[in-house]
Each structure stands twice: as structure tokens, then as C-alpha cells.
């Protein structure tokens, strides 16, 4: 550690004195101190020597001596006052900066340690302290007031008493800024933006943040806009607004904007879209087919997508038909708005009934026009089926009528014993009928088929059926010749129950 | 041994503010005094300001109240703002530790134009 | 205009000795230290003199610096071409509370 000469911790000197300083230490040492005037330093080797032969109450401070080349940073201080009976106070700054709740230092050195006494701590023009302000005094350091608060920023002085009256330093300006938590806070609206050409238009940023130290600005496609700036503060935030005013927009004002705010913890930005078309415009779409086929019983949500500019002035969904006129119930109708020109509309037509299929239609309507977007529902049905025996063309014949949708298949069994349903180990013959004659095919309608099975003789211990199916289910009908005639049996259990 | 680095915009648009700091490396910011002086294309050496490791700071009276300067002892950086500012504020920005009434050692310096 | 005052450009050939001179005044020179700076170009300043005369390590004692009165002089021995750059006179100015420079002296290394 370096030692200073004179080895006291503070010198008191009168104006116009001679002061030497020396230091010396192992290696090189370096002096710092309060920058003042009047100093000479003169270095020699492991020793150096600051001094000044016109010493003045500005050269009151701490001057500290230290050893680059410690690994320990060791230093050594002299606390010098030049004790001027006209300046009780060197003060070391104008202004002060420090955060909230850090203690905040103004550098009044007093030069006259005998002062210390009447020593006391006001604001300009001798008004006094804002209550709750808690502060202590270093004669070396000066007034500190500890966990300064924002409201506490103000112009401060330091007094002395001096032959019994108090003697007022020069003021220190005291800033204490709010901690600023991150980048301000940002607003862009709208979030998204269609004009037609020759309307109006306004788009706003604005930012707010704890502390004023802030900049914002409104870009458009890269380029900084010249805005005036609205300033309030209000919740404790200070808030600055920047409001752009087109009266009539054309297609250079189209793209890209965005509101950037910074302060010294960082930038913030978001961006917003600005479209400007030539006329309104009514766009419906379904990420749907519009084809739709569901089973009987089971539930379906129509959905449309709209996108629209001006606004909506009116939509409705519309049952077309074509089994009756009922319409879809407004409650089963629903709207939901993605953003300002972006819609969706749903139809939920929950358990569907025979009666339900057809065609739906949304229609919306703006200044643009009419628009339909028309979905086809068509319902899923497991096939029935059911056999006759009968005589075409003087051939017995047996005529199995299947209907369901999509459309069956038929295939036939013969299997020995009576018995409702034909299994695997009485089955004596399997036919496919693959090309059924369609007798029905109306759209959203179940499709009707007829298979026939020519039989020359009817085997009395034996069994027919007739099985049908598609995509959601099977049905079949067995048919048990007995000597007084045929006899059809349906299964027990009737596999279709909606 | 002690090294200074400023950083910051190199374009500021007139009436905006400049806003540089200094990162010190090699020793703490701690018990020391430091400076920004600037110095415009061609031309002379200008001292701005400085502040303490406290938060005081003293500004060269030709910049009127423009200047505010800052200290983030954690991360061992120094800050100078200087508002409105104008074409004639154009130069090159130093960061240096000030010594009694000397300056060693200096940043390498970084030019700030103001153009809009 | 700098409240120091050098003249703008000075020159010498290698080997030469040139002396630059600093003029100022009872608030800076004539009560206060002289130090001055070497702007080598391109780069930045580089404390030369400090203290009137003193030299930082480092420094070749080719460089040496004196006062008198309210005027200050770096003279530069044995001239070299690596001399060629800006030099710079500072002093503490007693009403401004800080340093204050002078305008500069291009020396050129003929």
C-alpha cells in the first residue's frame, strides 16, 4: 500500500499556502483527486509529489494515491482543506444524477472543519426541506439524502454558519430519475387499416414510460415521418402521441407503418398495415368443401370466412331446400370477428335430421354488393333392406331392395338351416352383385338399388340373404322358404337407429 | 491497464438527442472522475462535461443545460445525452478518465453526424 | 475559436529540434499547469506532457515541455517522421471549472 507525507488523514491549510503531497510505494504510484486548478505533479521513479504554491478553497478534497501494479489495489488518502473564510463550501458539481431510492451525493465540501457544527442542508431561495427528507453530513463528502425520491428533484444549497450567520454555497441541481423497467410501452392503432381512395384516415402511436427521457417516432415504410408530438403525463407515465391525418389517402400512402420507442433501456416497436384499395370489397370463403356429407344424427358447423371492407350491413344464413321451407334458427348462428375486416360466421346444425339435408347458403351484404357462399349437405345413411320373392319372366326370382347412402353394395348368401342371419360355417354360396340396378338417385336423397337372385328351386332347408352395405353401416334381410311359401325375415335387431 | 470504448448512434436527425456511453474496461469506474470531450472534422478539442462515480457531474457552460450525463456503476459504463441538437454539434465524441486536470487515458473515439 | 491559442501548422525535417508555442491567459496558463496531447492521425489523443514538463511512461524524452507566464512550449528533439500529427495545448480554466484546449498544431515531418 502507498504511503502519503504529511502521513495525516487531513491537512487544513489557509488560502495562498504551499502544499506538497508526496507518494510513494513500491512501483509507480498515480494521484487523483477532485479536478481543480493550481496542481503540479511531478513524478520521480516509485514516488510522487503533487503540489501547489497558491492553494485555494477549491482545491478542498479527498486526494487518493494508488499503485497500478498492486494486485490488492491498495490506496492511500489525504483529505486537504484550504480553510477560506469567505468560501466555507467547495462544491464539486452542478447536478447530481441518481436513480430512485439510491442515496443520493452533493459534493459540498466544507473548507473549514471547525464548520461542521452549523452545517445544514436547503433548497433554493432558502425554502426549506420537502418533509420526510432524510440526510446526513461528511465533512469530506458533503450532504447526502438517503433513497432520494423523484418528487425530491430540486435545486439545492448548503449552509454554513459562519460568525452567526448562515453562508449559502452555490446550488446543486439534484435529478433523481424513476427506474425505468424496460423500453416504454407502445400503442399502434388501428392494428390493421382499408381505406378506399380519396377517404380519410388517421393512424396513432404513442408510447408512455415511466421516466420523460424517451424518443418515439412513426415510420412509414422505413421512413421517419415528421409528426408533431402531443406530451401529458398522467397514472404517473409519461405519455407522448404521435397522430397521423390523412384527409384523402391514395395508393403512395399504402404499406407499411411502424411506431418505434427508445429510451436508455432499449427499443420497442410494432408494426401495422395500411391497404388502400379503389373500391369497396366483399370476399366470402370457407376453409370447408362446400360439398359436405355427414352421417344422420352426428352435428355439423358451417363456417365462413369474410373478409370486407366498408362493414358488414347485413348477412343471414338460408336453408334452400330441398326437403322444406324451414330456416335455420338464429340462435344456431353465430358471428365472430377475427379483426376490423376479417369475419367468421357459423352455422351449427347439431343431431341432423333426414329433413336437414340441402343446400345452405350465407349472404352478406356491404357497399360493395351482394355475396353468397352456398355449402351442399347431403347425410349418410347405414342401408335397409329387404327381399321379396317373386316371378319375372316365369323365372323365380328373388328382388332385394337396399337403400342408404352413399350408395350399398349388394352381396347374397346361401346357407343351410333356417336361421336370421347366415354365419361363416353355414354359408354354402356367396354371390356379389357388383353393378345393382340404381332405382332412385336424387341428390341429398338416399339411393335406392335392386339386386335380383335367380333361384331356380328354393332349397326348403336353406336359407337367403341379402346383405347390404357402405361407408357407415350394413343392413341384410333373410329370406326362409317353407313348403306353404316364402318367408322374409328381417334381423332382430334393425341395425339403423338415427 | 485501463481501456475506454464508446458506442452509440452514429446519425442523430437535428432536434433529437445524442446518446453515447462509454464501457471502461481493466478497472473499476469506481472513486474516479470521467469525461467526454469532442473535437468537429478539422477542427479543435472541446471538453463537454464530467461526472463522479456519484452522479455529479459539471458541464462546460457553452453547452447550456443540453447536457446530461449518467453513471451505471454495475456495469461499469458512463452516459452522456445532449439534446437539440444541431449541425454544429457534428464531431467526433471521446470518452477519457479525468486526472486532477488532465486526461489519460482516452477512448478511441466515435463520429456522431447530425443530418436529416 | 479556442481559448488557447496555437499557431495551425508547423513543420520540421528529420533530426531537427521545433518548438510549439501555446498562448493564454491569467485564468488558464498563467495559474494553472500546462499538459499537452498527441493526435497522431486518424486515431485518438494521447497524453504527451502532463504537469508542464512531466512525461507519462512511455513517452521518448525527445518531448519536453516548459511555462512561462500566461505561455507554454512542447519542444521535439531529433525530429522523426512518426512526429508527423496534431499537437494540442490544455489547461484548467478557473471560471469554466475545467480544462480548456488549445486549436491545435499540424506539425509536418518534411
Known amino acids: 500500500i502507498p504511503v502519503i507525507e504529511p502521513s495525516v488523514p487531513e491537512l487544513v491549510v489557509k488560502p495562498g499556502a504551499t502544499v506538497t503531497l508526496r507518494c510513494v510505494g513500491n512501483g509507480s504510484v498515480e494521484w487523483d483527486g477532485p479536478p481543480s486548478p493550481h496542481w503540479t505533479l511531478y513524478s520521480d521513479g516509485s514516488s510522487s509529489i503533487l503540489s501547489t504554491n497558491n492553494a485555494t478553497f477549491q482545491n478542498t478534497g479527498t486526494y487518493r494515491c494508488t499503485e497500478p501494479g498492486d494486485p490488492l489495489g491498495g490506496s492511500a488518502a489525504i483529505h486537504l482543506y484550504v480553510k477560506d473564510p469567505a468560501r466555507p463550501w467547495n462544491v464539486l458539481a452542478q447536478e447530481v444524477v441518481v436513480f430512485e431510492d439510491q442515496d443520493a451525493l452533493l459534493p459540498c465540501l466544507l473548507t473549514d472543519p471547525v464548520l461542521e457544527a452549523g452545517v445544514s442542508l436547503v433548497r433554493v431561495r432558502g425554502r426549506p426541506l420537502m418533509r420526510h427528507t432524510n440526510y446526513s453530513f461528511s465533512p469530506w463528502h458533503g450532504f447526502t439524502i438517503h433513497r432520494a425520491k423523484f418528487i425530491q428533484s430540486q435545486d439545492y444549497q448548503c449552509s454554513a454558519l459562519m460568525g452567526g450567520r448562515k453562508v449559502m454555497s452555490i446550488s446543486i441541481r439534484l435529478k433523481v430519475q424513476k427506474v425505468i423497467p424496460g423500453p416504454p410501452a407502445l400503442t399502434l392503432v388501428p392494428a390493421e387499416l382499408v381505406r378506399i381512395r380519396g377517404e380519410a384516415a388517421q393512424i396513432v402511436c404513442s408510447a408512455s414510460s415511466v421516466d420523460v427521457n424517451f424518443d418515439v417516432f412513426l415510420q412509414h415504410n422505413n421512413t421517419k415521418l415528421a409528426i408533431p408530438q402531443q406530451s401529458d403525463f398522467h397514472n404517473n407515465r409519461y405519455q407522448k402521441v404521435l397522430t397521423l391525418n390523412l384527409d384523402q389517402v391514395d395508393f403512395q400512402h399504402a404499406g407499411n407503418y411502424s411506431c418505434v420507442a427508445s429510451n436508455v433501456q432499449g427499443k420497442h416497436s410494432t408494426s401495422m398495415f395500411f391497404r388502400v384499395v379503389e373500391s369497396a370489397y366483399l370476399n366470402l370463403s370457407s376453409e370447408q368443401n362446400l360439398i359436405q356429407e355427414v352421417t344422420v344424427g352426428e352435428g355439423l358447423n358451417l363456417k365462413v370466412m369474410v373478409e370486407a371492407y366498408p362493414g358488414l350491413q347485413g348477412f343471414n344464413w338460408t336453408y334452400l331446400g330441398p326437403f322444406s321451407d324451414h330456416q335455420p334458427e338464429p340462435k344456431l348462428a353465430n358471428a365472430t370477428t377475427k379483426d376490423t375486416y376479417r369475419h367468421t360466421f357459423t352455422l351449427s346444425l347439431p343431431r341432423l335430421k333426414p329433413s336437414e339435408a340441402g343446400r345452405y347458403s350465407f349472404l352478406a351484404r356491404n357497399p360493395g354488393g351482394w355475396r353468397a357462399l352456398t355449402f351442399e349437405l347431403t347425410l349418410r345413411y347405414p342401408p335397409e333392406v329387404s327381399v321379396i320373392w317373386t316371378f319375372i319372366n316365369g323365372s323365380g326370382t328373388l328382388l332385394c331392395a337396399a337403400s342408404g347412402y352413399p350408395q350399398p353394395n349388394v352381396t347374397w348368401l346361401q346357407c343351410s338351416g333356417h336361421t336370421d342371419r347366415c354365419d361363416e360355417a353355414q354359408v354354402l354360396q356367396v354371390w356379389d352383385d357388383p353393378y345393382p340396378e340404381v332405382l332412385s338417385q336424387e341428390p341429398f336423397h338416399k339411393v335406392t338399388v335392386q339386386s335380383l337372385l335367380t333361384v331356380e328351386t328354393l332349397e326348403h332347408n336353406q336359407t337367403y340373404e341379402c346383405r347390404a352395405h357402405n361407408s357407415v353401416g350394413s343392413g341384410s334381410w333373410a329370406f326362409i322358404p317353407i313348403s306353404a311359401g316364402a318367408h322374409t325375415h328381417p334381423p332382430d335387431e334393425f341395425l339403423f337407429t338415427p | 491497464q485501463v481501456q475506454l470504448q464508446e458506442s452509440g448512434p452514429g446519425l442523430v436527425k437535428p432536434s433529437e438527442t445524442l446518446s453515447l456511453t462509454c464501457t471502461v474496461s481493466g478497472d473499476s469506474i469506481s472513486n474516479y472522475y470521467w469525461s467526454w470531450i469532442r473535437q468537429p472534422a478539422g477542427k479543435g478539442l472541446e471538453w463537454i462535461g464530467r461526472?463522479?462515480?456519484?452522479?455529479?457531474?459539471n458541464n462546460n457552460p457553452s453547452l447550456k443545460s443540453r447536457v446530461t450525463m449518467s453513471v451505471d456503476t454495475s456495469k461499469n459504463q458512463f452516459s452522456l445525452k445532449l439534446s437539440s441538437v444541431t449541425a454544429a454539434d457534428t464531431a467526433v465524441y471521446y470518452c477519457a478518465r479525468e486526472r486532477i486536470n488532465w486526461f489519460d487515458p482516452w477512448g478511441q473515439g466515435t463520429l456522431v453526424t447530425v443530418s436529416s | 475559436q479556442s481559448v488557447l491559442t496555437q499557431p495551425p501548422s508547423a513543420s520540421g525535417t528529420p533530426g531537427q529540434r521545433v518548438t510549439l508555442s501555446c498562448s493564454g491567459s491569467s485564468s488558464n496558463i498563467g495559474s494553472n499547469t500546462v499538459n499537452w496531447y498527441q493526435q497522431l492521425p486518424g486515431t485518438a489523443p494521447k497524453l504527451l506532457i502532463y504537469s508542464n514538463n512531466q512525461r507519462p511512461s512511455g513517452v521518448p524524452d525527445r518531448f519536453s515541455g516548459s511555462k512561462s507566464g500566461t505561455s507554454a512550449s512542447l519542444a521535439i528533439s531529433g525530429l522523426l517522421s512518426e512526429d508527423e500529427a496534431d499537437y494540442y495545448c490544455a489547461a484548467w480554466h478557473d471560471s469554466l471549472n475545467g480544462v480548456v484546449f488549445g486549436g491545435g498544431t499540424k506539425l509536418t515531418v518534411l
Open positions: 461526472i463522479y462515480t456519484s452522479g455529479s457531474t
